[in-house]
Interface confidence: low
């Protein structure tokens, strides 16, 4: 599966859940940057 990065968390989604399901370090970095930038 492939996650597109986005600027907001889905319902019940957390950085931890993303971390647990992300398939690569690259994907984690993409998520992290956009989530932090949206705060």
């Amino acid at each position: 599966k492939h996650k597109c990065f986005r600027k907001e968390l889905e319902e019940n989604e957390t950085l931890e859940s993303i971390m647990n399901t992300a398939e690569s370090e690259e994907e984690l970095k993409k998520y992290f940057y956009y989530l932090e930038g949206s705060k």
């Epitope: 950085l15 931890e16 993303i18 971390m19 370090e25 690259e26 970095k29 992290f32 940057y33 956009y34």
Partner: antibody
């Protein structure tokens, strides 16, 4: 105030075990990833291990994988490093360090403990 | 693993003068999708733990004097102290957090000339 207070260092024989502790205060401990970083006497910094805010995800340097275990008790605001099968080359000051963020990423450290000396010698 | 190499190993600078420390990574720490460099700088004084100065290669940590600045991208980075003060005598380390294991440079000792 915001701080990390370390304990548990000391002298241990090669092959022995030791547990380091790092008590956090002044911030919501469970919200942040934590790491251990060590510094051999007169040498540079070496990252050892990291753990996510929930404790579900752990990461290790190759030099300690299988011998060291990082853990945390968020109810006690405390980080641990269990060190087994210690070697002379593990002799160092061990620092606990706080990541500014809750996941493993991005991996830099904005708050450090004062360090605790671990000496492995017979 | 990504290797970090600093230069010089030590430097002596007169008070009020500029100090420049270089850091080179063995592979790029620039993540193209967000155009961020995964690099931090720390200051360590004798008998003390390291102190975060700069992250994302150029973002100054809160409370750090503006005489400290970071620059560079990809594999080549620089920490600049624009006007050296006596309290800046320390060892400075770069660190990459692009991938685990996180790795540090060997350190650069800054002294007063």
């Amino acid at each position: 105030q915001v701080q990390l207070v370390q304990s548990g260092g000391g002298l241990v024989q090669p092959g022995g075990s030791l547990r380091l502790s790092c008590a956090a205060s002044g911030f919501t401990f469970s919200n942040y990833a934590m790491s251990w970083v060590r510094q051999a006497p007169g040498k540079g910094l070496e990252w050892v291990s990291a753990i996510s805010g929930s404790g579900d995800n752990t990461y290790y340097a190759d030099s300690v994988r299988g011998r060291f275990t990082i853990s945390r008790d968020n109810s006690k605001n405390t980080l641990y490093l269990q060190m087994n099968s210690l070697r002379a080359e593990d002799t160092a000051i061990y620092y606990c360090a706080k990541d500014p963020h809750s996941s493993r990423w991005p991996g830099f450290f904005d708050l450090w403990g004062r360090g605790t000396l671990v000496t492995v010698s017979s | 693993d990504i290797q970090m190499t600093q230069s010089p190993d030590s430097l002596a600078v007169s008070l009020g003068e500029r100090a420049t420390i270089n850091c080179k990574s063995s592979q790029s720490v620039l993540y193209s999708s967000n155009n961020q460099n995964y690099l931090a700088w720390y200051q360590q004084k004798p008998g003390q733990p390291p102190k975060l100065l700069i992250y994302w290669a150029s973002t100054r940590e809160s409370g750090v004097p503006d005489r400290f600045s970071g620059s560079g991208s990809g594999t080549d980075f620089t920490l600049t102290i624009s006007s050296l003060q006596a309290e800046d005598v320390a060892v400075y380390y770069c660190q990459q957090y692009y991938s685990t294991p996180y790795t540090f440079g060997q350190g650069t000792k800054v002294e007063i000339k």
